[in-house]
């Protein structure tokens, strides 16, 4: 429908004015703005969303005016490349204007940065921001939107209204509470994670499309669709499918306002089709848009119809097996990929695919041989040891979770991954060592149905939080290899890495060891990030430190850092107990 | 326009056969698991079978197990439901529908009936 209705309008721009609404349409329109010049400040953004705004206005009451009939990128291209400052901020990015629709838009796309140099956001005073919330609501969710997109240039669009939504309700309320900060910081600090953790989902979504092609992430979508809507027929998951592939590969490439558009028909669409689809839809279908979409996305799997067959009667035991496979490969595939996944709600998505990565190279293998049903008969045991494996990962690291907890746990997590790839520098590895530490608390609450689909395709995204940083400034080989080769096999293949023997140790650095009374006033979070900074420099300077040996500098450390702060003149505790503590750790790591 | 064509009914004495055939159109054919339910006079809807979209799994009502064998052929947009040693409460009209163990009314063709008797 999408293609067609397209055709249908002279006006693209006016067509997407009056299906979003002027809100939604400044406000898309804004945050990809903020995702392509991630630098520019906002009364820039601002500026320029109001002459696209004013423009589209046009076209919307003459949709044969002058330039109305231009592509949306061609006109978000044009004003973006009005920016006086483009080459003194952006340097190279300014050549893209220099190149003619689609390669220009390719070229924004391709400047994006996932680790932009910003300064972290800092929150102010509740009754600050009460203040400006009520002097001016509109600019106040629009600085928001901004600051987000800016910082996460691969944020889902759609999504992020809906976050603003909510962060808008959570003023209105909280402003005009008793309490104001108990009522909102809480909201604000659960907005920020969930945030976070959409921007990395989302971020995942957009490496599959972009590295490794349509049908790596077509893939993906079989096997969760299928997994979240047992019920659903094949035609029905591969509609879906193709209608999900659009909407994120159109919200990947910038094309906010289309992907908006076309997630809302989606969301239309499954809830005027929940009959055939999932009997959980019903809750999510009576909602307004943005939650129902949101709702949707996040609902739980259906039940699995009664008395499915066994899948080897199909796809093992048929004699028409290569017939079917020959007749068109990819489809029957995607048959086997929707049977496996509606009977595994208790496997990750990724391990589904890696299942049907076996059987598609043993049926390339067995359909040329001279007794194909022999030789692909036993292909089903080949799946045992790909599920055992991530079933006693998964037991061995929640056991170890249990027995330290979430900080030790991450810590653990630091050493083993510093060792890995020592390459990789400390901001990058003690934020991605402590979001797969965080797979803990997430996931081993859950019973061992939940804990692999829960805890794998979590560690996915956070590997790709490591994979796109690394990719910005390729330090390392081993990450690289284990990025690149198979989306799939990524967990597996830093799982396998052991440590790096070639890494030539770091220069001791004192002043790395060097802390001050300013630690005392930091919140807890960020103390432990202190600490875990340090000890990854600890890794870097002696890789092969024991477990014990580590444990005892960072007990030490954690140590001084209490004695000191409970110090009369902590200033000077740091500077003498620091020193002594310096010399301590040389000594019991041998530096 | 999805379209569901039911024929070979008939009268038939107890302990007989017959095969009754579903043609599909209008819809992907080998894209559904398909099954087949009935209706005897003045009574509800009952399941009777169902095959998976590549047609070597399939599933049986307690009440028909060893007696019905289901089948489809994918190239002819076919589905088939033997039926042996037939009884007298399988008199019913016999429905083909789309989708595997249907929980939820779908639409129905018109039928073809089966009567059992001596």
């Known amino acids: 429908r999408g293609v067609f209705r397209r055709d249908a309008h002279k006006s693209e721009v006016a067509h997407r004015f009056k299906d979003l609404g002027e809100e939604n349409f400044k406000a898309l329109v804004l945050i990809a703005f903020a995702q392509y010049l991630q630098q520019c400040p906002f009364e820039d953004h601002v500026k320029l969303v109001n002459e696209v705004t004013e423009f589209a206005k046009t076209c919307v009451a003459d949709e044969s005016a002058e330039n109305c009939d231009k592509s949306l990128h061609t006109l978000f291209g044009d004003k973006l490349c009005t920016v006086a400052t483009l080459r003194e901020t952006y340097g190279e990015m300014a050549d893209c204007c220099a190149k003619q629709e689609p390669e220009r838009n390719e070229c924004f796309l391709q400047h994006k940065d996932d680790n932009p140099n910003l300064p972290r956001l800092v929150r102010p005073e509740v009754d600050v921001m009460c203040t400006a919330f009520h002097d001016n609501e509109e600019t106040f969710l629009k600085k928001y939107l901004y600051e987000i997109a800016r910082r996460h240039p691969y944020f889902y669009a759609p999504e992020l209204l809906f976050f603003a939504k909510r962060y808008k309700a959570a003023f209105t309320e909280c402003c005009q509470a008793a309490d104001k900060a108990a009522c909102l910081l809480p909201k604000l600090d659960e907005l920020r994670d969930e945030g976070k953790a959409s921007s990395a989902k989302q971020r995942l979504k957009c490496a599959s499309l972009q590295k490794f092609g349509e049908r790596a992430f077509k893939a993906w979508a079989v096997a969760r669709l299928s997994q979240r809507f047992p019920k659903a027929e094949f035609a029905e998951v591969s509609k879906l499918v193709t209608d999900l592939t659009k909407v994120h590969t159109e919200c990947c490439h910038g094309d906010l306002l289309e992907c908006a558009d076309d997630r809302a028909d989606l969301a239309k669409y499954i809830c005027e089709n929940q009959d055939s689809i999932s009997s959980k839809l019903k809750e999510c279908c009576e909602k307004p848009l943005l939650e129902k979409s949101h709702c949707i996305a996040e609902v739980e799997n259906d039940e699995m119809p009664a008395d499915l067959p066994s899948l080897a009667a199909d796809f093992v035991e048929s004699k028409d097996v290569c017939k079917n496979y020959a007749e068109a490969k990819d489809v029957f595939l995607g048959m086997f990929l929707y049977e496996y996944a509606r009977r595994h709600p208790d496997y990750s998505v990724v391990l589904l695919l890696r299942l049907a990565k076996t059987y598609e190279t043993t049926l390339e293998k067995c359909c040329a041989a001279a007794d194909p049903h022999e030789c692909y008969a036993k292909v089903f045991d080949e799946f045992k040891p790909l599920v055992e494996e991530p079933q006693n990962l998964i037991k061995q690291n929640c056991e170890l979770f249990e027995q330290l907890g979430e900080y030790k746990f991450q810590n653990a997590l630091l050493v083993r991954y510093t060792k890995k790839v020592p390459q990789v520098s400390t901001p990058t590895l003690v934020e991605v060592s402590r979001n797969l530490g965080k797979v803990g608390s997430k996931c081993c609450k859950h019973p061992e149905a939940k804990r692999m689909p829960c805890a794998e395709d979590y560690l996915s995204v956070v590997l790709n939080q490591l994979c796109v940083l690394h990719e910005k400034t390729p330090v390392s080989d081993r990450v690289t290899k284990c990025c690149t080769e198979s989306l799939v096999n990524r967990r597996p293949c830093f799982s396998a890495l052991e440590v790096d023997e070639t890494y030539v140790p770091k220069e001791f650095n004192a002043e790395t060891f060097t802390f001050h009374a300013d630690i005392c006033t930091l919140s807890e979070k960020e103390r432990q990030i202190k600490k875990q900074t340090a000890l990854v420099e600890l890794v870097k300077h002696k890789p092969k430190a024991t477990k014990e040996q580590l444990k005892a500098v960072m007990d030490d450390f954690a140590a001084f850092v209490e004695k000191c702060c409970k110090a009369d003149d902590k200033e000077t505790c740091f500077a003498e107990e620091g020193k002594k503590l310096v010399a301590a750790s040389q000594a019991a790591l041998g530096l | 326009e999805v379209q569901l064509q039911e024929s070979g009914g008939g009268l038939v004495e107890p302990g007989g056969s017959l095969r009754l055939s579903c043609v599909a159109s209008?819809?992907?054919?080998?894209?559904?698991?398909m099954s087949w339910v009935r209706q005897a006079p003045g009574k509800g809807l009952e399941w009777v079978s169902s095959?998976?979209?590549?047609?070597?799994?399939?599933s049986y009502a307690d009440s028909v197990k060893g007696r019905f064998t289901m089948s489809r052929d994918n190239a002819k947009n076919t589905l088939y439901l033997q039926l042996n040693s037939l009884k007298s409460e399988d008199t019913a009209m016999y429905y083909c529908?789309?989708?595997?163990?249907?929980?939820?009314?779908?639409?129905l063709g018109q039928g073809t009936l089966v009567t059992v008797s001596s």
């Open positions: 095959i998976s979209m590549v047609g070597g799994g399939t």
């Open positions: 209008g819809f992907t054919f080998q894209h559904y698991a």
């Open positions: 529908v789309r989708g595997w163990h249907p929980d939820v009314p779908r639409p």
